[in-house]
């Protein structure tokens, strides 16, 4: 348990300490305090570098001191013969004696007390970004007006996050723009538009001045745009280095402005607006789009009509056109539907005639019906040739979809009658 | 057939055989047989055969049997209580509608009907072919098909022949323009059992074809002149009857 003070005595003190001893003491005072360790008596066998017998004071990995020999106070008003001040709350004291002592040595007597440390001044690293306030047992950080203390309780920043922009048009600027932006801040702005609209950000080169990148090209202060899994930036420097128009292809955009402790500039100002999400004009062969436009955007509806001889097969129902809507995600509905050649299917059989199997039954294919000659002929004309028409029927130029009719040839005997002379 | 020659069914593929009464008919399309009214007046469900030269029972079993669906006798044919005493053979024509269509081939195919133009008006001397399994010089019924070629003759030639076994006065026999008189050459004639068969004449507009100019009807005496129903006069009735009693499959 941490204590505010304590006493440490060598073994058998004030009698002579024994040979071959190693003893250690772990001193701990409460958090926020340092340790003042002082010796009032020191009588340890002297050797070079205190190699034989010694008392060692260790703070963490650092040896604060190693003592041996005899000491006496230089100050008649103080019994202290040696002292140590450490700004940490833990200290280790180790006493060692070797196998022989040529004389009788009485060892040491030491005391420690918890002392206040000034965290604001005692360390190389300043614990607070702005104002440091010391108190007994600790310190606290504070901030100038309009700054707030971050959750780490050390860094100050401006309160520049949490804004959500939902209007279809707007303007966003860095804090204090065009005055220098605050150091050591992370500003997050959210733009959230209705689905189907993409955020388009517009910046002018002269409206951007952010601390430049270091020699390795890393931005010290940076402006980043994040739209879903796409990132634009980081951007920094004098004059905006990115595209002046950023089409995010998303209805949600996060703007993150991160600054460090130094080098504040005037910052940035941007405009944004919501563009209806564009849908690319897809290549749909054998079809016509109505209406025809150079650009299609969210909520646009087109009728895709198949060219003659092509049809949309949805499930197994044939149609000649379908509607497609530009959706909020920038994709067309019904995008799986395609215009494919009409299939007229197997031609119907006819009585007393036949149709040769066509190579194909698709649009434009030709079939020919013939009658079983010489006993049947085609009565209703048309020549027997049919083509696969756009409506999915086999069509003849004369008869249309009507099938040819094979009727018996009349009055033709297979062999002529010859009278036998008697 | 008197004075005729042996024929093959391929010479007369339209020839239909009726076994009761023993008679003939002419196939005019897949569903219809044309015959004489007196053939079917007593049997409205005749059994018919096509495609065989011989009408021997064993041969008929292998030929195509036709099943009638309905018999249509010309409305002008006078039905008698005692048909044997008939002296009026005017309008001796009937149609038999078949249940199933006939499949055509080398031994079965129809004969054409006459056109309605004057080209199909017969002149004396025009030749026609008759065929059948009726009485011959030697036997009452022929087993194998017989045929003969005979010329059209003036109606008076038929009138002049004395009826062989008259059932009434000679004057009682009716002769009308609905009848064709043919024969009188080399004793070639049709006879009992040939009734209903076609008197086939070469089509004036297509020499490769024959049409049914007449149907074997009656005669005063076998081996002289015979009378044939003039089919041309009935083409309208034939067409109307077939149209009114056809299935959509035939239309």
């Amino acid at each position: 348990e941490p204590t505010m003070y304590g006493e440490i005595l060598s073994p058998n003190y004030p009698q002579a300490y024994p040979s071959e001893v190693e003893k250690s003491w772990d001193i701990e005072v409460p958090e926020g305090y340092g340790i003042h360790l002082y010796f009032t008596h020191l009588d340890i066998e002297l050797s070079e570098n205190c190699a034989y017998d010694s008392v060692q004071i260790i703070s963490g990995d650092t040896e604060e001191g190693r003592l041996c020999g005899q000491r006496s106070s230089n100050n008649p008003h103080s019994p202290i013969v040696e002292e140590f001040q450490v700004p940490y709350n833990k200290l280790q004291v180790i006493f060692k004696s070797d196998f022989s002592n040529e004389e009788r040595f009485t060892g040491f007597a030491a005391y420690y007390v918890a002392t206040d440390i000034n965290e604001c001044t005692d360390f190389v690293d300043v614990p607070c970004s702005h104002f440091c306030n010391n108190f007994i047992g600790g310190y606290f950080c504070s901030c100038p007006p309009e700054y707030f203390l971050h959750d780490d309780m050390k860094n100050c920043g401006v309160n520049c996050s949490g804004d959500v922009f939902t209007a279809l048009i707007g303007e966003i600027a860095s804090p204090n723009y065009p005055k220098p932006y605050p150091e050591n801040s992370r500003c997050e702005y959210q733009i959230r538009l209705e689905k189907g609209f993409q955020v388009v950000v517009t910046l002018r080169r002269e409206d951007f001045d952010v601390e430049a990148a270091d020699s390795a090209g890393n931005c010290l202060d940076s402006l980043v745009f994040v739209a879903g899994d796409r990132q634009f930036g980081p951007y920094c420097g004098h004059g905006f280095p990115g595209p002046l128009n950023i089409e995010t292809k998303s209805n949600a955009l996060d703007i993150i402005f991160q600054t460090d402790l130094t080098g504040q500039k005037k910052g940035w100002k941007l405009r944004y607006h919501g563009d209806p999400m564009p849908c690319p004009k897809e290549d749909t062969p054998n079809s016509v789009w109505e209406p025809a436009k150079a650009k299609y955007v969210f909520r646009d509806v087109v009728q895709i009509t198949c060219l003659d001889g092509f049809e949309v097969v949805e499930g197994r129902v044939g149609a000649t056109s379908f509607y497609s809507t530009c959706q909020s995600n920038g994709k067309w509905s019904n995008s799986k539907l395609k215009c494919q050649p009409v299939d007229c299917g197997i031609p119907e059989s006819i009585e007393n005639g036949k149709v040769e199997d066509p190579e194909s039954t698709l649009f434009g294919s030709v079939i020919r019906y013939t009658c079983e000659e010489p006993y049947y002929y085609m009565e209703n004309g048309g020549g027997g040739e049919y083509h696969c028409a756009g409506n999915g029927s086999w069509v003849n130029e004369v008869l249309g979809p009507e099938l040819p009719k094979c009727v018996p040839v009349c009055g033709v005997p297979r062999e002529p009658f010859e009278e036998k002379q008697r | 057939i008197i004075g005729g020659s042996d024929a093959d069914i391929k010479n007369f593929p339209w020839q239909v055989f009726f076994d009761n009464p023993w008679a003939g008919g002419a196939l005019i399309n897949e569903y219809w047989v044309l015959t004489a009214a007196h053939v079917v007046e007593g049997n409205r469900e005749p059994t018919m055969y096509v495609g065989s030269t011989s009408v021997q029972t064993s041969r008929l079993a292998k030929s195509k049997m036709l099943t009638p669906e309905h018999v249509f006798i010309h409305p002008g044919w006078k039905l008698l209580e005692v048909p044997e005493g008939r002296t009026n053979f005017d309008n001796d024509i009937a149609l038999v509608r078949l249940k199933d269509p006939v499949k055509m081939g080398p031994t079965v195919s129809p004969i054409c009907l006459p056109g309605t133009s004057s080209d199909y008006n017969l002149m004396d001397g025009d030749l026609g072919l008759i065929s059948g399994w009726g009485r011959t010089e030697k036997r009452d019924r022929a087993v194998r098909l017989k045929a003969a070629r005979l010329p059209v003759a003036p109606l008076r030639k038929c009138k002049e022949v004395k009826v062989e076994k008259p059932t009434a006065d000679a004057e009682a026999y009716v002769f009308t323009p609905n009848m064709i008189c043919a024969g009188g050459e080399k004793g070639m004639d049709s006879c009992k059992g040939d009734s209903g068969g076609a008197f086939a004449v070469q089509d004036p507009n297509d020499k490769t074809k024959f049409y049914a100019a007449g149907l074997v009807s009656w005669g005063p005496q076998c081996g002289t002149y015979g009378l044939y129903t003039r089919v041309k006069n009935y083409v309208d009735w034939i067409m109307k009857t077939m149209q009114e009693n056809s299935t959509p499959r035939e239309d």
Epitope: V313, R316, V317, G318, D343, C344, G345, I346, P347, E348, S349, I350, E351, G353, K354, V355, E356, D357, P358, E359, T361, E372, G392, L403 | P248, R249
Partner: antibody, heavy 118, light 109 residues
Framework: EVMLVESGGGLVKPGGSLRLSCAAS????????MSWVRQAPGKGLEWVAT????????YYLDSVKHRFTISRDNSKDTLYLQMNSLRAEDTALYYC???????????WGQGTLVTVSS | QIVLTQSPATLSLSPGERATLSCTAS???????LHWYQQKPGKAPKLWIY???NLASGVPSRFSGSGSGTDYTLTISSLQPEDFATYYC??????????FGQGTKLEIK
Amino acid sequence: EVMLVESGGGLVKPGGSLRLSCAASGFTFSNYAMSWVRQAPGKGLEWVATISSGGSHTYYLDSVKHRFTISRDNSKDTLYLQMNSLRAEDTALYYCARLFTGHAMDYWGQGTLVTVSS
Amino acid sequence: QIVLTQSPATLSLSPGERATLSCTASSSVSSSYLHWYQQKPGKAPKLWIYSTSNLASGVPSRFSGSGSGTDYTLTISSLQPEDFATYYCHQYYRLHPITFGQGTKLEIK
């Protein structure tokens, strides 16, 4: 007279194969498209497959696609149905039928019974 | 696929009565491709009416067929004992599997 006579049916285990035949007579077989239709016991008619007159074009019920193959030999006036990977639900009386105007089936065989059971 | 629904599933009537059998398609069918078959127990189906209204060979004239679009009807003007059987409607559409209705059983009351 038009006649269609099916054969080749029988009892087969699931996953097994059968080949049905349909012998045609009384008409010019090569002039007609043909179909197989099945009827499960006590159930209605279900079309299975169709083949064009020359055999170049075939159409199948989705559930038999890639398992059944319809074919024909016009020189033998015979229609076939090769059935592989048979399932219990393929149990039925299988009819062959001739296709006519409007793809109506104007002549049917008497059927051959296929039973798929373990 | 085009589904054909026949109604009623069973029709009980007496000889001499008029019978009306209905076949409704889930989407429009060409009248040229709508057919009816008659099937008696243990027998193969027989083509009865083809292309909506044409009687097949040997079918008595008391039978008639009509309809268009999605609604088709087979009518028997005066039932005869031999007419009691199951009737199926059937459609062909080039993009579809050929389908049959589930059948209407016409039975003697």
